[in-house]
Interface confidence: low
C-alpha cells in the first residue's frame, strides 16, 4: 500500500518544498556568483578534500547515526540528506548576506560551502531530538528557523567578541543541543499505548547507527580544524581531535561494560560516546599544547557521555518526550558545555601566561558569548516548537509517530495505513 | 633572510591590465597571509588586497573590487596582483607584505595581525 | 568600513622631546592595531602591533596605548632617526585600513 499522507500535506508538502527551492534559484541567480580568481591548485584540492569531508559527516555519519529506530531509519537517513542539502543552500546565501552583502553579490567559495555544511551539520544534530515525530514540511521549516537562528549567532558573536570562523562555529554543539531539546519540548509527547515498540533499536539498523558513528569517528578532526586559519593550529586541531575521540571510544565500550549489572555493552551508549572526545575538544582544539591533556579530555567526555546515557534518558524522555536511543541532545549539551568550560579554563592559564592582566574581562567575554549562544538557542527553538505545532503542517499524529509507512512507499508491505 | 622580492611594475594605458609578482624567500610561504598596499606619489599607505596562506580567502578595498584579482602560488612561493580596468588614480608603488601573527593571549583568537616583512616596492604608472 | 583618522597630519619635535601622535578608528576595534614607520623613499617598517606591543628590534622610546577607538604613539626622547611618517592600521575585520599618517618633522 501506498503511504498515505494526510492529503492537505500531500498538496502542501511538494509545493511548499518546491517553492522554496524555486526561491533559492532566483536568489542565487540574482546574488551570487563564484570567485573568480585564480585559486592555487594544490590548494584547491586540500579545501575540497575539507569540504568532502563535512559532507560525508552530514550525509553518511549524521544519516546513518539517527537511523538505529526499528521502524524509522529509511526516514532518518533521508530526511537528514533532505535538511542537509536545503540547509547547506540557505547557509550559503545567509552567511553571504550577512557578510558580504554590502558589496552588492555574495562571492562563493570553496571555504562558503565549507562553512554553510558546518552550518546545516547544525540542523543534523539538533533534529535527532525530534526525528519521528514531524513530517518534512515540518523539517523545511526547522532548517530555515535553525539555519537563520545560527547564522545571525555567529554574526552577532563575530562583531561583538571579535572572535574567527573557528571560533564561533565551535558554538554549534552547544547551539544545536539546545535548540532541538527545546524544539522537542513543544512538541507532543505522549506515545500512546501500543506505539512503545516503534522508538526501540533493532539490530540492523543499529548496525547502520555504528556505520555512521564511525563515518563520524573518522572524520571529526577534518570538522574542528575545518574553520582555522594557521597551518599550525590546523594541526594541532587535527592531533587532538584524534587522540581524544580515539581515548573516548576506548572510555565509551569499557565504561559501557561497567555501568551493565551483568557487564554488557550497550549499543546506543557507543553510538554517541565514540564522538565524545570530538565534541569536548572542539572549541579549545588548537590551543592544546600536548596530547596528553587532549587525551584526559576524551577520557572525561566518554565517561560522562556514558554516564549521561545511563542515567538522563529517562528524565528527558518524561519532560522532552525524547526517546532512549535519541540521546545525541543532551550528550552534546553536556560536552559542548564541558567544551566551552575547558576553553575558559585554558583561556585564565593562557591569560596568566601573557601577564597582560585581562583575565577577568577574557573569562567575561567568553561567557558571554556561551550564554548568548545558549540563549538565542533556546529562544529560537521555542518559536520553531510553536511553528511545528500550528495545524497546517498536519503532523504525524502521536499513534504513528516513528513509522516509516506514514512517510514511504513499501510495495511489499500489505499494512496500510 | 626573509625577503619579499617584487616584480612587473610599468607604464600602462588607463583601461589596459599589468600582473605585479611579489616571489619570496627565507620563510615557509604557504604559512602566510599575504598583502597588497599602494602609495600614490606624495600620499599615504592605502591598502588594496589580502590572501589567506591557503588561497581560500581573499578581500579587498572597495577603491579595487572587482578590477583586482590577488592569488597566490605557493608552490612557486610567489604572491600575485593582476590589476586589469587600470585608472590613472592606480598610479603608485604598490607593495606586497607578509602578514605577521602575533599571539596576545593564545585563546580567545587575541592574535594581532600585522604586515612585518615588506618587498621593496613596485612603480605602476598608468598615463595615456 | 572602518576608516582610520590620524592627528595631526604633521607636527614639529625637538630633539630629546616627546611627542604623541593619536589614531581614531571609526568603530571598535579592540586592541588590533599596528604602528608602521616609513622615511622618505623607505619601506614602511612595522613598529608596534596589538596597540602596545613593541616589535623586536624597535627602540623602548616607542609606546603604544589605548583600545576600542583611540589610539596613541608616543615618541619619548625623540632622535633624528624618528622623523618619518607614522602610520596606524587597524586589522581587526577582513580589510586593512591604514590612517592617512602623522609626519614628524623636527623643530
Known amino acids: 500500500m501506498s503511504s498515505k499522507y494526510p492529503r492537505s500535506v500531500r498538496r502542501c508538502l511538494p509545493l511548499w518544498a518546491l517553492t522554496l527551492e524555486a526561491a533559492l534559484i532566483l536568489l542565487f541567480y540574482f546574488f551570487t556568483h563564484y570567485d573568480a580568481s585564480l585559486e592555487d591548485q594544490k590548494g584547491l584540492v586540500a579545501s575540497y578534500q575539507v569540504g568532502q569531508d563535512l559532507t560525508v559527516m552530514a550525509a553518511i555519519g549524521l544519516g546513518f547515526l539517527t537511523s538505529s529506530f526499528r521502524r524509522h531509519s529509511w526516514s532518518s537517513v533521508a530526511f537528514n540528506l533532505f535538511m542537509l542539502a536545503l540547509g547547506v543552500q540557505w547557509a550559503i546565501l545567509l552567511d553571504g548576506f550577512l557578510s558580504q552583502f554590502p558589496s552588492g553579490k555574495v562571492v562563493i567559495t570553496l571555504f562558503s560551502i565549507r562553512l554553510a555544511t558546518m552550518s546545516a551539520l547544525s540542523v543534523l544534530i539538533s533534529v535527532d531530538a525530534v526525528l519521528g515525530k514531524v513530517n518534512l514540511a515540518q523539517l523545511v521549516v526547522m532548517v530555515l528557523v535553525e539555519v537563520t537562528a545560527l547564522g545571525n549567532l555567529r554574526m552577532v558573536i563575530s562583531n561583538i567578541f571579535n572572535t574567527d570562523y573557528h571560533m564561533n562555529m565551535m558554538h554549534i554543539y552547544v547551539f544545536a543541543a539546545y535548540f532541538g531539546l527545546s524544539v522537542a519540548w513543544c512538541l507532543p509527547k505522549p506515545l500512546p499505548e501500543g506505539t512503545e515498540d516503534k522508538d526501540q533499536t533493532a539490530t540492523i539498523p543499529s548496525l547502520s547507527a555504528m556505520l555512521g558513528a564511525l563515518f563520524l569517528w573518522m572524520f571529526w578532526p577534518s570538522f574542528n580544524s575545518a574553520l582555522l586559519r594557521s597551518p599550525i593550529e590546523r594541526k594541532n586541531a587535527v592531533f587532538n581531535t584524534y587522540y581524544a575521540v580515539a581515548v573516548s571510544v576506548v572510555t565509551a565500550i569499557s565504561g559501557s561494560s561497567l555501568a551493565h549489572p551483568q557487564g554488557k555493552i550497550s549499543k546506543t551508549y557507543v553510538h554517541s560516546a565514540v564522538l565524545a572526545g570530538g565534541v569536548a575538544v572542539g572549541t579549545s582544539c588548537h590551543l592544546i599544547p600536548s596530547p596528553w591533556l587532549a587525551m584526559v579530555l576524551g577520557l572525561v567526555a566518554g565517561l560522562i557521555s556514558v554516564g549521561g546515557a545511563k542515567y538522563l534518558p529517562g528524565c528527558c524522555n518524561r519532560v522532552l518526550g525524547i526517546p532512549h536511543s535519541s540521546i545525541m541532545g543532551y550528550n552534546f549539551s553536556l560536552l559542548g558545555l564541558l567544551g566551552e568550560i575547558i576553553y575558559i579554563v585554558l583561556l585564565v592559564l593562557d591569560t596568566v601566561g601573557a601577564g597582560n592582566g585581562m583575565i577577568g574581562f577574557q573569562v567575561l567575554l567568553s561567557i558571554g558569548e556561551l550564554s548568548l549562544a545558549i540563549v538565542i538557542a533556546l529562544m529560537s527553538g521555542l518559536l520553531t516548537g510553536l511553528l511545528l505545532n500550528l495545524k497546517i503542517w498536519k503532523a504525524p499524529h502521536e499513534a504513528k509517530y516513528f513509522d516509516d509507512q506514514v512517510f514511504w512507499k513499501f510495495p511489499h508491505l500489505a499494512v496500510g495505513f | 633572510q626573509v625577503q619579499l622580492v617584487q616584480s612587473g611594475g610599468g607604464v600602462v594605458q588607463p583601461g589596459r591590465s599589468l600582473r605585479l609578482s611579489c616571489a619570496a624567500s627565507?620563510?615557509?610561504?604557504?604559512?602566510?597571509?599575504m598583502h597588497w598596499v599602494r602609495q600614490a606619489p606624495g600620499k599615504g599607505l592605502e591598502w588594496v588586497a589580502v590572501?589567506?596562506?591557503?588561497?581560500?580567502?581573499?578581500y579587498y578595498a572597495d577603491s579595487v573590487k572587482g578590477r583586482f584579482t590577488i592569488s597566490r602560488d605557493n608552490s612557486k612561493n610567489t604572491l600575485y596582483l593582476q590589476m586589469n580596468s587600470l585608472r590613472a588614480e592606480d598610479t603608485a608603488v604598490y607593495y606586497c607584505?607578509?602578514?605577521?601573527?602575533?599571539?596576545?593571549?593564545?585563546?580567545?583568537?587575541?592574535?594581532?595581525?600585522?604586515?612585518?616583512?615588506w618587498g621593496q616596492g613596485t612603480t605602476v604608472t598608468v598615463s595615456s | 568600513d572602518i576608516q582610520m583618522t590620524q592627528s595631526p597630519s604633521s607636527l614639529s619635535a625637538s630633539l630629546g622631546g616627546t611627542v604623541t601622535l593619536t589614531c581614531r578608528s571609526s568603530?571598535?576595534?579592540?586592541?588590533?592595531l599596528n604602528w608602521y614607520q616609513q622615511h622618505p623613499g623607505k619601506v614602511p617598517r612595522l613598529l608596534i602591533s596589538?596597540?602596545?606591543r613593541l616589535q623586536r628590534g624597535v627602540p623602548s622610546r616607542f609606546t603604544g596605548g589605548g583600545s576600542g577607538t583611540d589610539f596613541t604613539l608616543t615618541i619619548k626622547n625623540v632622535q633624528p632617526d624618528d622623523i618619518a611618517t607614522y602610520f596606524c592600521?587597524?586589522?581587526?575585520?577582513?580589510?586593512?585600513?591604514f590612517g592617512q599618517g602623522t609626519t614628524v618633522e623636527v623643530k
Open positions: 607584505a607578509r602578514e605577521t601573527v602575533v599571539v596576545a593571549a593564545k585563546i580567545r583568537n587575541h592574535y594581532y595581525y600585522a604586515m612585518d616583512v
Open positions: 627565507g620563510f615557509t610561504f604557504s604559512s602566510y597571509g
Open positions: 590572501i589567506w596562506y591557503d588561497g581560500s580567502n581573499k
Open positions: 568603530q571598535f576595534i579592540s586592541r588590533y
Open positions: 596589538g596597540a602596545s
Open positions: 592600521q587597524h586589522s581587526y575585520r577582513s580589510g586593512r585600513a
